[in-house]
């Protein structure tokens, strides 16, 4: 090996990576908010809706301060993978019923996938432990009715909104520790 010529800076610094991850998460949060408004407008639904297969909210915003970087990123990635799977399921199962939301749902899926890749890259750059993904979950059962699917859509978008809101706060807090 010859003398070190040095390399030009080829890719973003992890702190810059974290900044762009926060921006992407914020824009995804806004997409989800807009989509939730559209869904409520087109398919009004009273009260909160739950779906047993969705992840429970990772952490209250107040308890974020005690979290460590690896646990935040690992948990966030696991939860977002679950939401990605649910959005894919929703698009497949409810294609015709949610046709009016389709372009936006497709964009949401693409951006969610991009955010997951960004988180993985950030974990690689920091050399944080990347736990093996959970074993594949059993396939989600198709909704029992159109109304059941719409309730599921409300639950998925509502849960994703809360998770992304938590994610923005968590990532901003982590930035101060990097």
């Amino acid at each position: 090996p010859g003398p070190p010529p040095g390399s030009p800076r080829a890719s973003p610094d992890p702190r810059a990576e974290l900044d762009s991850t926060v921006l992407l998460t914020r824009s995804l949060l806004e997409d989800t908010r807009q989509l939730t408004i559209q869904l409520k407008d087109k398919f009004p639904a009273d009260g909160d809706h739950n779906l047993d297969s969705l992840p429970t909210l990772a952490m209250s915003a107040g308890a974020l301060g005690a979290l460590q970087l690896p646990s935040v990123l690992t948990r966030l990635r696991a939860d977002l993978l679950s939401y990605l799977r649910h959005v894919q399921w929703l698009r497949r199962a409810m294609g015709s019923s949610l046709k009016t939301l389709e372009p936006e749902l497709g964009t949401l899926q693409t951006r969610l996938d991009r955010l997951l890749r960004r988180l993985q890259l950030l974990m690689s750059r920091l050399a944080l432990p990347q736990l093996p993904p959970d074993p594949p979950a059993p396939p989600l059962a198709p909704p029992s009715s159109t109304w059941g699917g719409i309730r599921a859509a409300h639950a998925i978008l509502g849960g994703l909104h809360l998770t992304l809101d938590w994610a923005v706060r968590g990532l901003l807090l982590l930035k101060t520790r990097l």
């Epitope: 800076r9 890719s11 992890p14 702190r15 890749r117 993985q120 690689s124 920091l126 050399a127």
Partner: antibody, heavy 114, light 111 residues
Framework: EVQLLESGGGLVQPGGSLRLSCAAS????????MHWVRQAPGKGLEWVAV????????YYADSVKGRFTISRDNSKNTLYLQMNSLRAEDTAVYYC???????WGQGTLVTVSS | QSVLTQPPSASGTPGQRVTISCSGS?????????VHWYQQLPGTAPKLLIY???ERPSGVPDRFSGSKSGTSASLAISGLRSEDEADYYC???????????FGGGTKLTVL
């Protein structure tokens, strides 16, 4: 400009020890996980060890576990690899690398031979 | 034996397009971990060519592109040039090792 400069390689007898160093400049060293990757003569790349950006996580390839120790000093922008109980099969060019790895040093040759 | 599998050699004539494949196992590529590609010119250190399956670091020509589908990934080089003659390695995080694994490398010859 990013620079990673390895040093400390050389000829050592089987069973002996060496300590490799890697001096980093041109980037925020303390924000990057750091790796050691080696390449035996005429062979492919083999990952050796990794340490997280803050030194709290360290992982090793099975082939070096219990013999090699990776460490870092963020105040000095320096990465280390302490190699004990060296074997002939550890003969290789050892590269220090940052991030994915995104950046690589030019390597230092370690020869284990009697 | 490498954890990721690449063809040992590939070749093409100037101007041609060549593709190098990389396949993995359940603890790396199959688990959804991203694939990165490195170029190692003779006598030099490896250089990052593609990261996160398809992203190009600044300074890497757009003749180089990467893709990933399910259990494998591939690197494509279009408009082949003599200076592309090098060894190419794929890498991915491996959850059983808690570190990256490399393919065995593909020696590209420009005829």
């Amino acid at each position: 400009e990013v620079q990673l400069l390895e040093s400390g390689g050389g000829l050592v007898q089987p069973g002996g020890s060496l300590r490799l160093s890697c001096a980093a400049s041109g980037f925020t060293f303390s924000s990057y996980g750091m790796h050691w990757v080696r390449q035996a003569p005429g062979k492919g790349l083999e990952w050796v060890a990794v340490i997280s950006y803050d030194g709290s996580y360290k992982y090793y390839a099975d082939s070096v576990k219990g013999r090699f120790t990776i460490s870092r000093d963020n105040s000095k922008n320096t990465l280390y690899l302490q190699m004990n109980s060296l074997r002939a099969e550890d003969t290789a060019v050892y590269y220090c690398a940052a991030g994915v790895p995104d950046y690589w040093g030019q390597g230092t040759l370690v020869t284990v031979s009697s | 034996q490498s954890v990721l599998t690449q063809p040992p050699s590939a070749s093409g004539t100037p101007g041609q397009r060549v593709t190098i494949s990389c396949s993995g196992s359940s603890s790396n590529i199959w688990s959804g971990y991203d694939v990165h590609w490195y170029q190692q010119l003779p006598g030099t250190a490896p250089k990052l060519l593609i990261y996160s399956n398809e992203e190009r670091p600044s300074g890497v020509p757009d003749r180089f592109s990467g893709s990933k589908s399910g259990t494998s990934a591939s690197l494509a080089i279009s408009g082949l040039r003599s200076e592309d003659e090098a060894d190419y390695y794929c890498a991915a995080w491996d959850s059983s090792l808690y570190g990256p694994v490399f393919g065995g490398g593909t020696k590209l010859t420009v005829l």
